[in-house]
């Protein structure tokens, strides 16, 4: 799996999970989120050569096509596979609100 | 939806469905598929700017992060959303086999 256990331990040019910490205030201007101050969002990036974690039959065919026809611009792309939620605390007036935001943290990647 | 109805009618630099016909023999070297000789596989390509068909909360946040911090290399990628199967005819010896290959044709795209 192209997850932290694999990707953060190996230097990898191919599609893999990359670390990204987002500070809500500094990076997004979101002062209204009280907790947490930021989070490990992570992201997916890297090349998708033939059979590198291909997600579907189409991405397999496309990576093979791209290998045989390297002048073609059609190739799979490295995107998130497994995502997890993030729980935040913010206020509406003086009323605290705890909310779980779905699909905020990338845990693994794939070529699609 | 970033499908043929929209993408094939508009000149679009952003993430969209792109036409791609794959000839099994010429493009993949697959002489064993008897019918069809090829098919409209299509593929997804293009930029994923802020809010362009964002798939998840993470891709929205990532595109916002990338817009505010343009020096960052973290941005969503244009990938397939809806896929359809392709039915093929091939032979095992002299015995014809009809098989449906899942997820072979891209029908629409998303930024993920």
């Amino acid at each position: 799996a192209l997850d932290a256990a694999y990707c953060f331990r190996n230097v990898q040019d191919n599609c893999c999970l990359r670390p990204l910490y987002i500070d809500f205030k500094r990076d997004l201007g979101w002062k209204w989120i009280h907790e947490p101050k930021g989070y490990n969002a992570n992201f997916c990036a890297g090349a998708c050569p033939y059979l590198w974690s291909s997600d579907t039959q189409h991405s397999r065919v496309l990576s093979l096509y791209n290998t045989i026809n390297p002048e073609a611009s059609a190739s799979p792309c490295c995107v998130s596979q497994d995502l997890e939620p993030l729980t935040i605390l913010y206020y509406i007036g003086k009323t605290p609100k705890i909310e779980q935001l779905s699909n905020m943290i990338v845990k693994s990647c794939k070529c699609s | 939806a970033l499908d043929a109805a929209y993408c094939f009618r508009n000149v679009q630099d952003n993430c969209c469905l792109r036409p791609l016909y794959i000839d099994f023999k010429r493009d993949l070297g697959w002489k064993w598929i008897h019918e069809p000789k090829g098919y409209n596989a299509n593929f997804c390509a293009g930029a994923c700017p802020y809010l362009w068909s964002s798939d998840t909360q993470h891709s929205r946040v990532l595109s916002l992060y990338n817009t505010i911090n343009p020096e960052a290399s973290a941005s969503p990628c244009c990938v397939s959303q809806d896929l359809e199967p392709l039915t093929i005819l091939y032979y095992i010896g002299k015995t014809p086999k009809i098989e449906q290959l899942s997820n072979m044709i891209v029908k629409s795209c998303k930024c993920s």
Epitope: G29 | L51, L64
Partner: nanobody, 118 residues
Framework: EVQVVESGGGLVQPGGSLRLSCAAS????????MGWFRQAPGKQRELVAI??????TYADSVKGRFTISRDNAKNTVYLQMDTLKPEDTAVYFC?????????????WGQGTQVTVSS
């Protein structure tokens, strides 16, 4: 349902100014990311400016000419457009991206026409 309503478009001569306004629902405005986009005939929609909390970001084509600002008391975001050029002619759309709450999602206004012509 979040309402997003633009106003302030019109016809202006090259070099002139216009101020667009966009009002959004009070219940979500303070944490909404407010954006201005535009679409010229036959072109794809493009981002003009974003106001995300206290961060403002502009497309290269409008930097130094356009200013986005927000008034949280009036639940309104403004786009001050100065030194307008013919290539700024487009329909301008306001967007509210609401990341939290029951109204979470993206909301678009109907658009307001800006025409720069002599």
């Amino acid at each position: 349902e979040v309402q997003v309503v633009e106003s302030g478009g019109g016809l202006v001569q090259p070099g002139g100014s216009l101020r667009l306004s966009c009002a959004a629902s009070a219940s979500v405005f303070s944490w909404s990311v407010m954006g201005w986009f535009r679409q010229a005939p036959g072109k794809q929609r493009e981002l003009v400016a974003i106001s995300s909390g206290d961060r403002e970001t502009y497309a290269d084509s409008v930097k130094g000419r356009f200013t986005i600002s927000r008034d949280n008391a009036k639940n309104t975001v403004y786009l001050q457009m100065d030194t307008l050029k013919p290539e700024d002619t487009a329909v301008y759309f306001c967007n509210a991206y609401v990341p939290v709450g029951e109204s979470r999602g993206d909301y678009w206004g109907q658009g307001t026409q800006v025409t720069v012509s002599s």
